[in-house]
Interface confidence: medium
Amino acid sequence: KVFGRCELAAAMKRHGLDNYRGYSLGNWVCAAKFESNFNTQATNRNTDGSTDYGILQINSRWWCNDGRTPGSRNLCNIPCSALLSSDITASVNCAKKIVSDGNGMNAWVAWRNRCKGTDVQAWIRGCRL
């Protein structure tokens, strides 16, 4: 599923991401835009043999199990394929664990490079939330 901007903002708010660990909803929507272009089925392979999955591009080396990433920790205790569902519950729950891990949203390279320090509220402007 490819979400609309406001549609995703509403879904993320429903799942409790607004101000989760101090990150406003705009940060999460911005991250999803530049990680996956709002596409729940996005997959991208990394040079270390791992793969990033879903709307927030969660990595198989640390967070989920895709059955083929050497040394996978699976800290979210889920199959990576669950992160590709049109229902973003699994991605959000795992993202909450990631953002609580110490580095905050710096764990997402796209957020760090494209969202951090910008007017992230623009990503939810005009949305009825």
């Epitope: 089925q41 392979r45 043999g49 059955g67 050497p70 199959p79 990576c80 394929s81 590709l84």
Partner: antibody
């Protein structure tokens, strides 16, 4: 136990297309990548690409882009590979395998012969 | 693409001999190297994964070693059922690639 059952041998004419199937049993089909591998005598084993059945995400070896197309049907736990514009170079044994990085589970292979 | 070069191409041995098969990668692949056995008209069978981990049901006479670019599959006291082709494969990067194979034949 994990099993991959491939469709039977095919004899096709040059220019035609063929669709090979790979039915998976014994595990959660949508969760694991399915890989496709080509074997020709004297050419060893070649990785064609992969599909994640749960999402339909696909990756292809550049060499096989435009030649192979992967699909999957999660209702029947079956992955498919279509090969188009067949030539004699496509005559080979084609295997599906469960994509665990290493391939511990293989289909029995489908022999494709392309001949006029 | 990562090239895997296997040597020798053919190895002629007598049952009871111990042998080593080599696989060399064109660049470092860490420990993401796997070994397969293939007998005529059969599918490949995983022997060793991640350089040295035995696959389930594989006899203990098969072992693997190496790191980076140079890897070895060793068979301690070859049995008649071991004759066939052996392939290495890397899963360090895409596309996945296989070595050209070593044929283990009876002398």
């Amino acid at each position: 136990q994990v099993q991959l059952q491939e469709s039977g041998a095919e004899v096709m004419k040059p220019g035609a297309s063929v669709k090979i199937s790979c039915k998976a049993t014994g595990y959660t089909f949508s969760t694991y990548w399915i890989e496709w591998v080509k074997q020709r005598p004297g050419h060893g084993l070649e990785w064609i690409g992969e599909i994640l059945p749960g999402s339909g995400s696909t990756y292809y070896n550049e060499k096989f882009k435009g030649k192979a197309t992967f699909t999957a049907d999660t209702s029947s736990n079956t992955a498919y590979m279509q090969l188009s514009s067949l030539t004699s170079e496509d005559s080979a044994v084609y295997y599906c395998a469960r994509g665990d990085g290493n391939y511990g589970y293989w289909g029995q292979g489908t022999t494709l012969t392309v001949s006029s | 693409d990562i090239e895997l070069t296997q040597s020798p191409a053919t190895l002629s041995v007598t049952p009871g001999d111990s042998v080593s098969l080599s696989c060399r990668a064109s660049q470092s692949i860490s420990n993401n190297l796997h070994w397969y056995q293939q007998k005529s008209h059969e599918s490949p069978r995983l022997l060793i994964k991640y350089v040295s981990q035995s696959s389930s049901g594989i006899p203990s006479r098969f072992s693997g070693s190496g790191s980076g670019t140079d890897f070895t599959l060793s068979i301690n006291s070859v049995e008649t059922e071991d004759f066939g082709m052996y392939f290495c494969q890397q899963s360090n990067s895409w596309p996945r690639t296989f070595g050209g194979g070593t044929k283990l034949e009876i002398k």
